[in-house]
């Protein structure tokens, strides 16, 4: 099951998955001025069997102004620091989730990828939180969140982390230096519509769409 929404927002903190469960989707987003190559993948999917998991596609971007395809290369350091989701493959992780069966590692960067990676997580995914640069962590419990399925609905557990404004930074488990501080993602809306589907199962629609129309006549 895909999780209905993003992990919770914690003021002055960012989250990171150490590994991605099978079924996780990563959108092939390109930075401004670039787009997916023609016939390029729309997303990458963590897929595999009990012994090995990997991302089933590669994302590729090309300039919006040209039709030339780009190569799959590692960004230069100045490009890499733009990326909001930095790779954290430290051997000091408390549990090396990436080596667990049914998990994929962080996909390598692709040229001209968007500055923020958009993942769609599955039930059972765990993410870890750290305070951004300039803030210190006060732990009341685990600084992590897990996507759980309860009564047919998905929800993320609330991480027990407060980031206070002291010039000291906390770190992800096993990380030696704090990463550059990305700004938080837009806050999620929380309105829900409870509905009975045609399949006669009571479910919570965590998302709704509503269309309306404007017409104009050319003079």
């Amino acid at each position: 099951e895909l999780c209905d929404d993003d992990p919770p927002e914690i003021p002055h903190a960012t989250f990171k998955a150490m590994a991605y469960k099978e079924g996780t989707m990563l959108n092939c987003e390109c930075k401004r001025g670039f787009r997916r190559i023609k016939s390029g993948s729309l997303y990458m999917l963590c897929t595999g069997n009990s012994s090995h998991s990997s991302w089933d596609n590669q994302c590729q971007c090309t300039s919006s102004a040209t039709r030339n395809t780009t190569k799959q290369v590692t960004p230069q350091p100045e490009e890499q620091k733009e990326r909001k989701t930095t790779e954290m493959q430290s051997p000091m992780q408390p549990v090396d989730q990436a080596s667990l069966p049914g998990h994929c590692r962080e996909p390598p960067p692709w040229e001209n990828e968007a500055t923020e990676r958009i993942y769609h997580f599955v039930v059972g995914q765990m993410v870890y939180y750290q305070c951004v640069q300039g803030y210190r962590a006060l732990h009341r419990g685990p600084a992590e969140s897990v996507c759980k399925m309860t009564h047919g609905k998905t929800r993320w557990t609330q991480p027990q982390l407060i980031c206070t404004g002291e010039m000291e930074t906390s770190q992800f488990p096993g990380e030696e230096k704090p990463q550059a501080s990305p700004e938080g993602r837009p806050e999620s809306e929380t309105s829900c519509l409870v509905t009975t589907t045609d399949f006669q199962i009571q479910t919570e629609m965590a998302a709704t769409m509503e269309t309306s129309i404007f017409t104009t006549e050319y003079q």
């Epitope: 401004r32 089933d56 769609h120 993602r185 806050e187 999620s188 965590a206 998302a207």
Partner: antibody, heavy 102, light 107 residues
Framework: PGSSVKVSCKAS????????ISWVRQAPGQGLEWMGW????????NYAQKLQGRVTMTTDTSTSTAYMELRGLRSDDTAVYYC????????WGQGTTVTVSS | DIRLTQSPSSVASSVGDSVTVTCRAS??????LAWYLQKPGQAPKLLIF???RLHTGVPSRFSGSGSGTDFTLIINSLQPEDFGTYYC?????????FGQGTKVEIK
């Protein structure tokens, strides 16, 4: 015919910028036709070839609303127009009927 | 563009029957295929994505399989609410494309 229409699609209950918006239409008694997709994250678009030049998709992240404008309307543009969440299209709008008549 | 061909175009079945719908892609789309059910006057509803993953709230009598170019949707023990038109759709590359639909009617 010749006029334009702008259909809006207001999303709620999820992080708007984490997903794109797909637009699909359905002519009376016909199947589903993909019109295009827009990234709510960065505004990148991809349009169906046959609509290129007539269609424009935009988003307003401040109101979590997507828009689809179709210009130079013809009678064969008569259809129900749907928006749906991202390319997986797991959540759909109720549809907006556009009738092009002379 | 990737073409999707569904078969049969229509089928008449009774409640309790098992129904199989197939979808063939004109080129390899890995497992990036979704199935939707649309009832008259309603928007389509996602049933299955990534060829076999059941969308939230969809009963387990629906199942999907296949990869590459050949895909199958099976509905076991058809229920009254399952009647309508089923569409397959590829989400591998743009432009996204739909099959022409399979109408499942009451016999």
């Amino acid at each position: 015919p010749g006029s334009s229409v702008k259909v809006s699609c207001k999303a709620s209950g999820y992080t708007f910028t984490s997903y794109g918006i797909s637009w699909v239409r359905q002519a009376p008694g016909q199947g589903l036709e993909w019109m295009g997709w827009i990234s709510a994250y960065n505004g990148n678009t991809n349009y169906a070839q046959k609509l290129q030049g007539r269609v424009t998709m935009t988003t307003d992240t401040s109101t979590s609303t997507a828009y689809m404008e179709l210009r130079g309307l013809r009678s064969d543009d008569t259809a129900v127009y749907y928006c749906a969440r991202d390319f997986r299209m797991d959540v759909w709008g109720q549809g907006t009927t556009v009738t092009v008549s002379s | 563009d990737i073409r999707l061909t569904q078969s049969p175009s229509s089928v008449a079945s009774s409640v309790g029957d098992s129904v199989t719908v197939t979808c063939r892609a004109s080129q390899d789309i890995k497992r990036r295929l979704a199935w939707y059910l649309q009832k008259p006057g309603q928007a389509p509803k996602l049933l299955i994505f990534d060829a076999s993953r059941l969308h939230t709230g969809v009963p387990s009598r629906f199942s999907g399989s296949g990869s590459g170019t050949d895909f199958t949707l099976i509905i076991n023990s058809l229920q009254p609410e399952d009647f309508g038109t089923y569409y397959c759709q590829q989400a591998n590359t743009f432009p996204q494309t739909f099959g022409q639909g399979t109408k499942v009617e009451i016999k």
